[in-house]
Interface confidence: medium
Amino acid sequence: MMTGTIETTGNISAEKGGSIILQCHLSSTTAQVTQVNWEQQDQLLAICNADLGWHISPSFKDRVAPGPGLGLTLQSLTVNDTGEYFCIYHTYPDGTYTGRIFLEVLESSVAEHGARFQIP
């Protein structure tokens, strides 16, 4: 039975040209995290594998930095970066947990962070 929950940074906004940290946290489970995939829609951004470390997609390696932790730092933001991001935790023995973050990249200088929320 999957008992864990994914806590994410929820709905967030950031300024065009700036950077943002995408962060998820898996709690309430003793399952071992074997790999975390970061995806935007169906596109791979990066993978953090427990044994192999980080692998950044060719499409993003010029502006994606690994970390902090299992999170991802997205740099040089453009309006096209607006959208859904998913952290996909591969765990043993529980299986897969998925968290969702919605990022809005704003033209203006007003960019406030949304509240945290949980996905069961």
Epitope: T34, Q35, N37, Q43, L44, I47, N49, D51, L52, G53, W54, H55, I56, S57, P58, S59, K61, D62, H90
Partner: antibody, heavy 120, light 107 residues
Framework: QVQLVQSGAEVKKPGASVKVSCKAT????????IEWVRQAPGQGLEWIGE????????YYNENFKDRVTMTRDTSTSTVYMELSSLRSEDTAVYYC?????????????WGQGTLVTVSS | AIQMTQSPSSLSASVGDRVTITCRAS??????LNWYQQKPGKAPKLLIY???SLHSGVPSRFSGSGSGTDYTFTISSLQPEDIATYYC?????????FGQGTKVEIK
């Protein structure tokens, strides 16, 4: 030594599916992506997609996304590429190749190729 | 997808000649470019990665250079065993794409 050994030639009718295998030996299977590239007769190289054997994460060229499925069997260090709804334009040699997990992206070892002929 | 345009599509040169192949990307690819050699009926073989790094075991007569959108592959002294088709390959953005190939023949 490193080897990628592919399954034998196939002849298929339009609308059918084909499943090509690629058996890896001589290296740590989970440490490398397996790439699939095809080459139509007398033509250049076209990337189909990739799979990371350790987790099964896979990413496909949009041109094939609706028709291709990549799977792996870690017990036999074998990767499979299945292409459905075949048409005559899919007649090609299909290659698997390996790409190291990490920051440099190149296909350093290739399978011998599998000729798939689609003909009514 | 990034388009890779290779030129020439074919060339004929004498043994010992210096041979140059160019590859132009439809947008900047930041040196994320490889070169492969393919002989008839065989799988491609990696020669150069990341624009100019020579893959292990590859003879030093092969070299690569370039930046931005324009890249060059050179064989400093053509040998009979170099008869093949050469492909550039960008990995700046998915999907990975290849040039259409340059067929090298001996005069």
């Amino acid at each position: 030594q490193v080897q990628l050994v592919q399954s034998g030639a196939e002849v298929k009718k339009p609308g059918a599916s084909v499943k090509v295998s690629c058996k890896a030996t001589g290296y740590t299977f989970s440490n490398y992506w397996i790439e699939w590239v095809r080459q139509a007769p007398g033509q250049g190289l076209e990337w189909i997609g990739e799979i990371l054997p350790g987790s099964g994460s896979s990413y496909y060229n949009e041109n094939f996304k609706d028709r291709v499925t990549m799977t792996r069997d870690t017990s036999t260090s074998t990767v499979y590429m299945e292409l459905s709804s075949l048409r005559s334009e899919d007649t090609a040699v299909y290659y698997c190749a390996r790409q190291k997990y990490g920051n440099f992206y190149y296909f350093d070892f290739w399978g011998q190729g599998t000729l798939v002929t689609v003909s009514s | 997808a990034i388009q890779m345009t290779q030129s020439p599509s074919s060339l004929s040169a004498s043994v010992g000649d210096r041979v140059t192949i160019t590859c132009r990307a439809s947008q900047g690819i930041g040196n994320y470019l490889n070169w492969y050699q393919q002989k008839p009926g065989k799988a491609p073989k990696l020669l150069i990665y990341y624009t100019s790094s020579l893959h292990s075991g590859v003879p030093s007569r092969f070299s690569g250079s370039g930046s931005g959108t324009d890249y060059t592959f050179t064989i400093s002294s053509l040998q009979p065993e170099d008869i093949a088709t050469y492909y550039c390959h960008q990995y700046s953005k998915l999907p990975y794409t290849f040039g259409q190939g340059t067929k090298v023949e001996i005069k």
